[in-house]
Interface confidence: medium
């Protein structure tokens, strides 16, 4: 039986005034429990830290790598893991913090102008691959600066909100992350109500705009749980 | 620009197998999901699978499952699907699709018969 | 399972609006959430209309628009030209595994 697809307007970086400093976790204005707000790169509620399920280390944060979180568990079962320090045991680029490789089985410090020039040359195809080269261990320490000297449109590939132009939010779609319009007056929003109820979200929605806020519709206040359609509104 | 171009249909018996391929362009291939989706004659879309961007996450239609296999290269911007064992009702246009904002950018599509 | 029900056909003269609709069953509320409408000409590949029930892409006229109520997603197409003649196809997605299904598809004819 197919599962639902579950959607969520928790964006990892929610700009000002929106959400904290770029990057940090967003403010817990007017805040009712259960409600998601991006905590690092998991989904925080209010009093609840779930872990985020993944497939590949592309889905995690920067500072994350898709893992079983028990050694030799269910290889179905990944999650993002924080990534490794220095001289922790890795086995492979993404397993170690930004600024480390793995190298013979241990996360080890890039030396920056040794790996500079070859980095510039292939981020940008190798985008999205594997972490099991240089290339994808690149990816992770220099996008962001090779890839967005322009501002991200509707639909391109992204890490954060301020990789997008305006008007637009980075957010999960198929486990990649791309530009999305900023939700208006009227469209449909999505608000948690229970602890851990977002699920595997591959759909994340945008924020609400300025002025507006994820409510539920009016004409569905007598509608069941399952059905009720939150809307973007009016404060 | 944006390009998708399906090819590797064909007539086949059934029980055979073919090989599809889609050659993109225009786009930064290896940062995107891929599709397969299919219409047979006069009928409407069935999504048939859909891939990772490093091709490591492979979904498939209960239709389809254990018969076609997914996959891609990036090094070549090219997506695949192995389809064996095909029967009459594998029959259909094969459209490769990618998965940006949703199934945003489509090639033409190629056929696939099964008939004896 | 999931399953999308369209009408089979709709009708409109030039400059008239008319709408498609497209029923989620009960089993798939919660996944009905996401909802893309794609246009198809004859001999054509589909087109991306709306997706997340009311977004349009760049490109897209604004005569073409999406709302969702309830379990069921509508795609109004305004000041109907003979253009927009074609099947139009809803489409929602599911995770856990990864799969998409389709509306059967509507015919729409500009008489």
């Known amino acids: 039986t197919l599962n639902s697809v579950l959607n969520s307007n928790a964006i990892k970086n929610l700009p000002p005034p929106l959400g904290g400093a770029a990057g940090h976790p967003g403010s817990a204005v007017s805040a009712a429990p259960g409600i998601l707000y991006p905590g690092g790169n998991k989904y925080q509620t209010i009093d609840n830290y779930q872990p985020y399920p993944c497939a590949e280390d592309e889905e995690c944060g920067t500072d994350e790598y898709c893992a079983s979180p028990t050694r030799g568990g269910d290889a179905g079962v990944q999650i993002c893991l924080a990534c490794r320090k220095r001289r922790k045991r890795c086995m492979r680029h993404a397993m170690c913090c930004p600024g480390n490789y793995c190298k013979n089985g241990i996360c080890v410090s890039s030396d920056q102008n040794h790996f500079r020039g070859e980095i510039e040359e292939t981020i940008t195809e190798s985008f999205g691959n594997d972490h099991s080269t240089l290339d994808g261990y690149s990816r992770r320490t220099t996008l962001s600066s090779k890839m967005y000297h322009t501002k991200g449109q509707e639909g391109s590939v992204c890490l954060r909100s301020s990789d997008c132009a305006s008007g637009l939010c980075c957010a999960r779609h198929f486990w990649s992350k791309i530009c999305k319009p900023v939700l208006k007056e009227g469209q449909v929003c999505t608000k948690h109500r229970r602890k851990g109820s977002h699920g595997l979200e591959i759909f994340q929605r945008c924020y609400c705009g300025e002025g507006l806020s994820c409510r539920i519709q009016k004409d569905h206040h007598q509608a069941s749980n399952s059905s009720r359609l939150h809307t973007c509104q009016r404060h | 620009q944006v390009q998708l171009v399906e090819s590797g249909g064909g007539l086949v018996q059934p029980g055979g197998s073919l090989r599809l391929s889609c050659a993109a362009s225009g786009f930064t291939f290896s940062s995107y999901w891929m599709s397969w989706v299919r219409q047979a004659p006069g009928k409407g879309l069935e999504w048939v699978s859909g891939?990772?961007?490093?091709?490591?996450?492979?979904h498939y239609a209960d239709s389809v499952k254990g018969r076609f296999t997914i996959s891609r290269d990036n090094s070549k911007n090219t997506l695949y699907l192995q389809m064996n064992s095909l029967r009459a009702e594998d029959t259909a246009v094969y459209y490769c699709?990618?998965?940006?904002?949703?199934?945003?950018?489509w090639g033409q599509g190629t056929l696939v018969t099964v008939s004896s | 399972d999931i399953a999308l029900t369209q009408p089979a056909s709709v009708s409109g003269s030039p400059g008239q609006s008319i709408t498609i609709s497209c029923t989620g069953t009960?089993?798939?509320?919660?996944?009905?959430?996401?909802v893309s409408w794609y246009q198809q000409h004859p001999g054509k590949a589909p087109k991306l209309m709306i997706h997340?029930?009311?977004n349009r892409p760049s490109g897209v006229s604004n005569r073409f628009s999406g709302s969702k109520s309830g379990n069921t997603a509508s795609l109004t197409i305004s000041g109907l030209q003979a253009e927009d003649e074609a099947d139009y196809y809803c489409?929602?997605?599911?995770?856990?595994?990864?799969?998409?299904?389709f509306g059967g598809g509507t015919k729409l004819t500009v008489l």
């Open positions: 997340d029930g009311s």
């Open positions: 891939i990772s961007y490093s091709g490591s996450n492979t």
């Open positions: 489409q929602t997605w599911a995770t856990s595994p990864l799969s998409s299904v």
């Open positions: 009960s089993s798939d509320v919660g996944g009905f959430n996401y």
């Open positions: 699709a990618r998965m940006g904002i949703d199934l945003d950018y």
